[in-house]
Interface confidence: medium
């Protein structure tokens, strides 16, 4: 088979949007199966037609309704003949149109009067492509060959820039880039103390508008009264917009405020936010916990705990906790230093402990008191006898048979 491209130049140039028909003439085969190839890949296009000129002469057509840049390339046709593929001479298809932008000016945010650059690049074919710059509706530069960089010495207000690309086919306009002025950030808002303890406070806030410049840090200022002496100033990188204030004095009134900064400087401060650290939990455990056996049950008594300092605040109720080795356990809150215990099994060992609480929480537990089941069996002992045992910490918690003098601690009591 002799293959040749018939009636088509080796280089074919068409305008964008125009139809294209490539012809391929095959002579010496009765029924050729013509394949079109573009840049090495078979064209899977259904617009492929065949016309028999004679029995041994066929023309194949590849039809493109509307040429676009992506259609440009090297085309050839091929047929299989006796197991071998014969390839025609190629056609170089060039699709010409108005310039096509490969780089367009981007939006920017710049400090007032600071210099900056904008870039623009467009390609043909046809070449050459020249660039004209516009600032708003005013032509400010060019024509210059593509690619082009516009150097601007500075702006004092938000300004629009665009570029225009020209070639023999016409012109194309780029997107409009807006150059915004950077400014100081706005004050933060929703400043909240999210967690409080006696010596720490967690703070969170929402950043205000960043002034089109990345927020770099925020400052948390702490005083003991709004406008008072600065107790603490913490500078935190952001995000996240949170801060942990440490080493505060318990049960103390504070105020805090926050500001954030970008490259141009700091925002105004947000409003003062008052807060109070929590007081200290009681430092002492109730002493001399003991049990009094009565006909109606068991009365527990202990000594009153006196506050060690003003930071503990007023001491509130006592919390009593008891457990038995059958798994029964309970807690009760009592106002005084005496409690009547019910609902426990006298046949089982009983372990009791007590602590004093305030607004912050409960203080340390007292030494556990073990009331042995042997004390109750057969109503042993006078009705008002007092029996108490001090339990050494760390002794086994897994004994199930106890002598009268044995004592043990329970896992639930480990702190």
């Amino acid at each position: 088979a002799g293959l040749k491209l018939m009636g088509a130049p080796v280089k074919l140039t068409v305008s964008q949007g125009q139809p294209v028909k490539l012809n391929c003439s095959v002579e010496g085969m009765e029924e050729p199966d013509i394949q079109w190839v573009k840049d090495g890949a078979v064209v899977q296009n259904l617009d492929q037609l065949y016309i028999p000129v004679s029995e041994q002469h066929w023309i194949g057509f590849l039809s493109l309704k509307s040429a676009e840049r992506s259609d440009a390339g090297r085309y050839w046709c091929q047929v299989e003949d006796g197991g071998e593929t014969e390839i025609s001479q190629p056609v170089w298809l060039t699709v010409e149109g108005v310039p096509f932008f490969t780089v367009e000016p981007k939006d920017l945010a710049v400090p007032p009067n600071a210099p900056f650059q904008l870039s623009c690049e467009a390609v043909g074919p046809p070449e050459p492509v020249t660039i004209v710059w516009w600032r708003g509706t005013t032509k400010i530069g060019g024509p210059a060959p593509s690619p082009s960089v516009l150097n601007v010495t500075g702006v004092t207000q938000s300004t629009m820039f665009s570029c225009e690309a020209h070639n023999l086919k016409g012109l194309a306009s780029s997107r409009t880039a807006t150059v915004h002025l950077q400014a100081l950030p706005a004050a933060p808002f929703n400043v909240t103390v999210t967690k409080l303890s006696s010596s720490n406070a967690s703070v969170a806030w929402m950043p205000g508008a960043d002034g089109r410049a990345l927020l770099q840090s925020c400052t948390v200022q702490v005083t003991q009264a709004p406008g008072g002496w600065e107790v603490l100033a913490v500078v935190v990188p952001v995000p996240p917009f949170t801060c942990l204030l440490r080493d505060l004095v318990p049960a103390t009134n504070y105020s805090l405020r926050v500001r954030c900064a970008n490259a141009l400087g700091p925002s105004p401060y947000a409003d003062w936010v008052p807060f109070q650290t929590k007081g200290l939990a009681p430092a002492s455990a109730p002493q001399n916990l003991h049990a009094i056996r009565t006909d109606s049950g068991l009365i527990l008594e202990w000594e009153e705990v006196i506050p060690e300092g003003p930071l503990e605040g007023p001491l509130g109720p006592y919390k009593l906790s008891w457990v038995q080795d059958n798994g029964t356990q309970d807690e009760l809150t009592v106002e005084g230093t005496r409690a009547n215990l019910t609902g426990w099994d006298p046949q089982k060992d009983l372990i009791v402990r007590v602590c004093v609480s305030n607004a912050v929480g409960c203080g340390p537990w007292s030494q556990p008191l073990v009331v042995s089941s042997h004390d109750h069996a057969g109503q042993q002992g006078p009705p008002h006898s007092r029996t108490s045992w001090l339990v050494p910490r760390g002794s086994s918690a897994h004994h199930h048979h106890h002598h009268h003098h044995s004592a043990w601690s329970h896992p639930q009591f480990e702190k």
Partner: antibody, heavy 125, light 108 residues
Amino acid sequence: EVQLVQSGADVKKPGASLTISCQASGYTFTDYWISWVRQKPGKGLEWMGQINRHASNTMYGPSFQGHVTISADRSTATAYLQWRSLEASDTAMYYCVRSGGATSGGTIPEYYQHWGPGTLVTVSS
Amino acid sequence: SYELTQPPSVSVSPGQTARITCSGDALPKKYAYWYQQKSGQAPVLVIYEDWKRASGIPERFSGSSSGTMATLTISGAQVEDEADYYCYSQERKGNYFVFGGGTKLTVL
């Protein structure tokens, strides 16, 4: 005169296999492609696929790929549409159509001018 | 998968101009074809390659294409033009063809 003669109507049960045919006459079979078009009762036309003039290359619509097979026998100038396992949703009229290809007139031919009369396939249990 | 969108129905009085549209993203690059199908009959080619009239089709039928829209125009519609009309084209890569959903033309 160009003629496309299709096989007769058929009733099948779901899961059955079926092949329908389209015999061309009045032109050189290997000058043209053959396409198949489906039309469900009361519905629109759907392009199923086509086979090239040398019966060496097939193209299918996305909805039909893997569900039907298009083939052709050049010696008898016949194109075929085949199902391995029919479903009730295959109930439809099936047309074969002569697609673009060659013309002795020497001009780019018109596509899809010649249609077979259609084969009605009913799939019902 | 690629779709061609047509209005379900168009109504005109005899002698009026009927316009049936077909929209598809690939139509700027791919030709549109139009078929007429009367009840119980096989479809008939009316327009090929956007605007070319198929042989035997009356001159009142014309086609055009602009951007993503192809249009079949029947100038001075006749009662016998009452039928379903389908547009037909390729998806962008040319790997398969697609029919539009069809438009029922009523000539009252």
